[in-house]
């Protein structure tokens, strides 16, 4: 029998190198039953996640799972940071892992990075 | 169940580069985190570096000072190593390794490959 | 890195005793998700690695209930209440909390 929890589906430490400037789409997959759960994104402040108000958010309906998507548009140097989405269901707060955003500044980067040196070395990115 | 099978040569020459592939069956590869780890004969483990398949994100330990590379075929639903200038030091069992992303609910090795280096 | 010291180094059991294994991390393995990602492996002669123990009191499907983990912060204990003779391995933890992940360098549970 298959649970009928919510379920957000962000792996732990997961990351993405993004561009300033350029558009980018953060997703949040929700696995939920019969009612989908009211769901919102927070960029975090030290230990705290600060619940990000008035930006455009949108739903994604596929097969077997729903995305919750925080659009960045286009993206800033200051959007580098870890988000988490979290979902209201039945009264309890279901929070996903938090996935960060690595964002390389093209102003300040002599050449745009390929994806691979990107992805394999995040620490010389923008932070 | 999910498995994980290591394929590749068991000899490498010094200077050369040592290619690994592991192919998982019973989960698909993008839920998971897929890792490399390595065993000396007779001694610990040392963990290599691992990737997101969903996206090709992925991480390393310094301490293999970019030699090694890690990539990852959905389509396949496999991943692949490949450790470059390699010495007698790196010979090793190479083990791949996958576990869920999400709620790290399993956590399962393939049954490793003697790599030994030597002309 | 983060460093695992594990102890002792060959721990030497008959069957049917208690086996206590210490693990102690050089840095608090508490993540910012509040959990604490403290495995612990066996291995026996020949075969590939096994996790018994996540988030340092998990047990994985089908490990016995005569293995627990315990814990927090830089201390960790694995104990088999009672040890069988299929139990004669090495055991090692690990951590998952940070990059670069790193294990202990293991304990031997040998036949006393």
């Known amino acids: 029998k298959e649970s009928c929890d919510v379920q957000l589906y962000i792996k732990r430490q997961s990351y993405h190198s993004i561009f300033a400037g350029d558009p980018f789409k953060l997703e949040c997959p929700v696995k939920y039953c019969a009612h989908r759960p009211q769901v919102t994104w927070c960029k975090l402040n030290g230990t705290t996640c600060v619940k990000l108000e008035g930006r455009h958010t949108s739903w994604k309906q596929e097969k077997n799972l729903s995305f919750f998507i925080l659009h960045f548009e286009p993206v800033l140097p200051s959007d580098n940071g870890s988000y988490r989405c979290s979902a209201n269901f039945l009264s309890a707060i279901i929070e996903s892992h938090s996935t960060t955003l690595y964002v390389t500044d093209v102003k300040s980067a002599s050449e745009r990075p390929s994806k691979d040196e990107m992805a394999s070395r995040p620490w010389l990115l923008y932070s | 169940q999910v498995q994980l099978q290591e394929s590749g040569p068991g000899l490498v020459k010094p200077s050369g580069t040592l290619s690994l592939t592991c192919a998982a069956s019973g989960v698909n590869i993008k839920d998971t985190y897929m890792y490399w780890v390595r065993q000396p004969p007779g001694k610990g483990l040392e963990w290599i570096g691992r990737i997101d398949p969903a996206n090709g994100y992925t991480r390393y330990n310094p301490s293999f000072k970019s030699r090694a590379t890690i990539s990852a075929d959905k389509s396949k639903n496999q991943a692949s190593l490949k450790l470059s200038s390699v010495t007698a030091a790196d010979t090793a069992v190479y083990y791949c390794?996958?576990?869920?992303?999400?709620?790290?609910?399993?956590?399962?090795w393939g049954q490793g490959t003697l790599v030994t280096v030597s002309s | 890195e983060i460093v695992l010291t594990q102890s002792p180094g060959t721990l030497s059991v008959s069957p049917g005793e208690r086996a206590t294994i210490s693990c102690r991390s050089s840095?608090?393995?508490?993540?910012?998700?509040?959990?604490?990602?403290l495995n612990w492996l066996q291995q026996k002669p020949g075969q590939a690695p096994r996790r018994l123990i996540y988030l340092v009191s998990k047990r994985d499907t089908g490990v016995p209930d005569r293995f627990s983990g315990s814990g927090s912060g830089t201390d960790f204990t694995l104990t088999i209440s009672r040890v069988e003779p299929e139990d004669f391995a090495v055991y090692y933890c690990w951590q998952g909390t940070l990059f670069p992940r790193t294990f202990g360098q293991g304990t031997k549970l040998e036949i006393k």
């Open positions: 390794a996958v576990y869920d992303g999400y709620y790290e609910s399993f956590d399962v």
């Open positions: 840095q608090s393995l508490l993540d910012s998700d509040g959990k604490t990602y």
